[in-house]
């Protein structure tokens, strides 16, 4: 046993923080109770409401390069959200991971994965409003459904990546009062004769390239494509921001005001190894930076709601769809639906930005309904005049 | 109250072993960290390594890898020190001390053993 | 390994004195230093931790404080039982290391 845990070195932060005690203090447990009781919440909000978006998104709305960009946010989310009851266990139980080793570093790989692909995916979005508004015919013939879903790959397979490093270096750690901590362990692999420089090496380039990646370089081209659509459309007179720039908006204020607090807190840690002073400020409010950066997935639906009324619009009609299927008679269904049911081309053009908020036509008749539903998602509902009539250049 | 009780003195030969035990009480044994320091007149205190008997997790200073191996026994709240290959360098009075944390920070040796005094004699 | 330079090595001193002890660390160790008295019968007590500290049954004569890299025990008034040798200890990192100590004696 012991000989065993010589083999499996830990850094000093590390070693310290398995030290902590749980808490005695009755206030402090009220707290606990809130915790597990707001993430308990938190975890159910955000399956339902990102399950309901992707539902809404890829099944009620004409597939466009806009709500591609929404469907994959919101599969993030939903990937982020699917792990947080487990996250509320391990609050459940004292603050102890009983899940075991595996469990912890695919729970953890889940959390930096949508930490990831939430900043690529953003920064392509931005991205994509420039194109159009700065190279509009560039993006009336290249911008298609198929190309985003391409782009939107990459950028899953580039996190993934990007996750790689967090999943091999998760580690399950027991703590002097018997609880376990599933925590970063950066000497499980090759720790090297100066275990003490690796600890710093390690934990410091794990925060910069996190905080560079997933956090400064989305939020820099965010901003320089802001700058860019901003500028080009000042000149052409254009005042007031469209509303997927609101939507846009308020997932990039929400994207930074949640993973910011927890990167501030994460570079601390790094930096934690060389000025052990700021280990117990660190290990305080980490636990409150790492759940604000969780709810970030429970945020983006509401964001896409509230900044977008067609959506809403959308969820009320839908949320009926699926109560008339319930209620309607075997005699109803028929083919009609399926008959009149049109597919979207995988290269269909987007006709706008707009898309995601726009109000096209919807089917008439439960008939018509029960069909499209039936026939999953692939049906698509007629083409509004509305976005039939806008610009591949609105902003 | 707290109290870490050592063994007693012993004499040994050189090449030989000698294996030191720490008795803890008044505390619960597995919520905190054993720590062993090695006294030499006129050199100072030299801290060897410490114990988490909870899970067996040992952390050494590299000057004493190979020379010390600390094991711990939960039944008998009883930590222990071996030290092997003995030589005159190993002469000195060894300690034991608890070490352990709060909510939200961790702090070392508050309480000590009253020492082991070993010497190494042929 | 971090070292821990203390100073003076020996101090004489009477009773009622003021007396201050210096540790220096070698690198940063935020505050994560300990005090320990061992007396002449080589029993060691904590007195002070987190480098200012009072540790619980300990008199208020002693105090403990930091000024950079440098840390300071403070006796404001010696008593006879305070006669003792002195040591600081880092615990920022392993592996802990101790201050060469401070032999306090009667004047």
């Known amino acids: 046993m012991s000989a065993n845990a010589t083999l499996k070195p830990l850094c000093p932060i590390l070693e310290q923080m398995s030290r902590l005690q749980s808490h005695s203090n009755t206030s402090i447990r009220y707290i606990d109770h809130a915790a597990v009781l707001l993430h308990g919440l938190a975890s159910l909000l955000g399956l339902v409401e990102n399950g309901v978006i992707l539902f809404v998104v890829g099944c009620r709305m004409r597939q466009t390069v806009v709500t591609t960009w929404v469907l994959h946010l919101a599969l993030s989310d939903l990937l982020a959200s699917a792990s947080l009851p487990f996250f509320t266990y391990f609050l459940a139980v004292g603050h102890s991971w009983e899940l075991g080793t595996t469990f912890c570093k695919l729970h953890s790989s889940i959390f930096f994965l949508n930490m990831f692909a939430s900043g690529f995916l953003l920064s392509a979005i931005s991205l994509d409003r420039c194109l159009q508004v700065v190279r509009p015919v560039w993006a009336q013939n290249h911008r298609t459904v198929a190309a985003a879903h391409k782009v939107c790959l990459v950028l899953w397979a580039l996190a993934v990546l990007n996750t790689v490093p967090y999943f091999v270096f998760r580690d399950t750690i027991s703590r002097l009062d018997g609880r376990i901590m599933c925590y970063y362990n950066v000497l499980l692999l090759n720790p090297g004769p100066d275990r003490d420089a690796t600890c710093n090496s390690r934990q410091v380039a794990l925060a910069v390239s996190k905080f560079l990646l997933a956090f400064l370089v989305p939020l820099a081209i965010i901003a320089s494509s802001h700058a860019a659509v901003s500028l080009r459309l000042q000149h052409r007179g254009r005042r007031r921001p469209g509303r997927f720039v609101r939507l846009v908006a308020a997932v990039v204020a929400a994207f930074a005001l949640c993973w910011g607090p927890y990167h501030v807190f994460s570079l601390l840690e790094a930096r934690a190894h060389a000025n052990p002073g700021l280990r117990p400020l660190v290990w305080r409010g980490l636990p409150f930076v790492t759940s604000l950066a969780f709810f970030n997935s429970v945020a983006n639906p509401v964001l896409y709601v509230l900044t977008c009324p067609d959506m809403l619009r959308k969820l009320r009609r839908s949320l009926r769809t699926v109560l008339e299927s319930v209620l309607v008679d075997d005699s109803e269904l028929g083919g009609a639906g399926s008959s009149r049911r049109r597919r979207t081309s995988s290269t269909a053009r987007s006709a706008s930005p707009l898309a995601l908020c726009s109000r096209p036509e919807e089917p008439r008749g439960p008939a018509r309904l029960l069909g499209w539903l039936l026939g999953s998602c692939a049906a698509s509902p007629q083409t509004g005049p509305l976005n039939r009539a806008l610009s591949s250049t609105s902003s | 109250q707290v109290q870490l009780q050592q063994s007693g003195a012993d004499l040994v030969r050189p090449g030989t072993s000698v294996k030191v035990s720490c008795k803890a009480s008044?505390?619960?044994?597995?919520?905190?960290?054993i720590d062993w320091v090695k006294q030499r007149p006129g050199q100072g205190l030299e801290w060897i390594g410490a114990i988490h008997p909870g899970s067996g997790r040992t952390h050494y200073n590299e000057k004493f890898k190979g020379k010390a191996t600390l094991t711990a026994d939960k039944s008998s709240s009883a930590a222990y020190m071996q030290i092997s290959s003995l030589t005159s360098d190993d002469s000195a009075v060894f300690f034991c001390?608890?070490?352990?944390?709060?909510?939200?920070?961790?702090?070392?040796?508050?309480?000590w053993g009253q020492g082991t005094s070993v010497t190494v004699s042929s | 390994d971090i070292q821990m330079t203390q100073s003076p090595s020996s101090l004489s001193a009477s009773l009622g004195e003021r007396v201050s002890l210096t540790c220096r660390a070698s690198?940063?160790?935020?505050?994560?230093l300990s005090w320990l008295q061992q007396k002449p019968d080589g029993t060691f007590k904590r007195l002070i931790y987190?480098?200012?500290t009072l540790d619980s049954g300990v008199p208020k004569r002693f105090s403990g404080s930091r000024s950079g890299s440098d840390y300071s025990l403070t006796i404001s008034s010696l008593e006879s039982e305070d006669f003792a040798d002195y040591y600081c200890l880092q615990y920022a990192n392993y592996p802990y290391t101790f201050g060469g100590g401070t032999k306090l004696e009667i004047k």
């Open positions: 008044g505390y619960a044994f597995t919520n905190y960290l």
């Open positions: 987190a480098a200012s």
């Open positions: 690198q940063e160790i935020g505050g994560y």
């Open positions: 001390a608890r070490s352990g944390g709060s909510s939200f920070d961790y702090y070392a040796m508050d309480y």
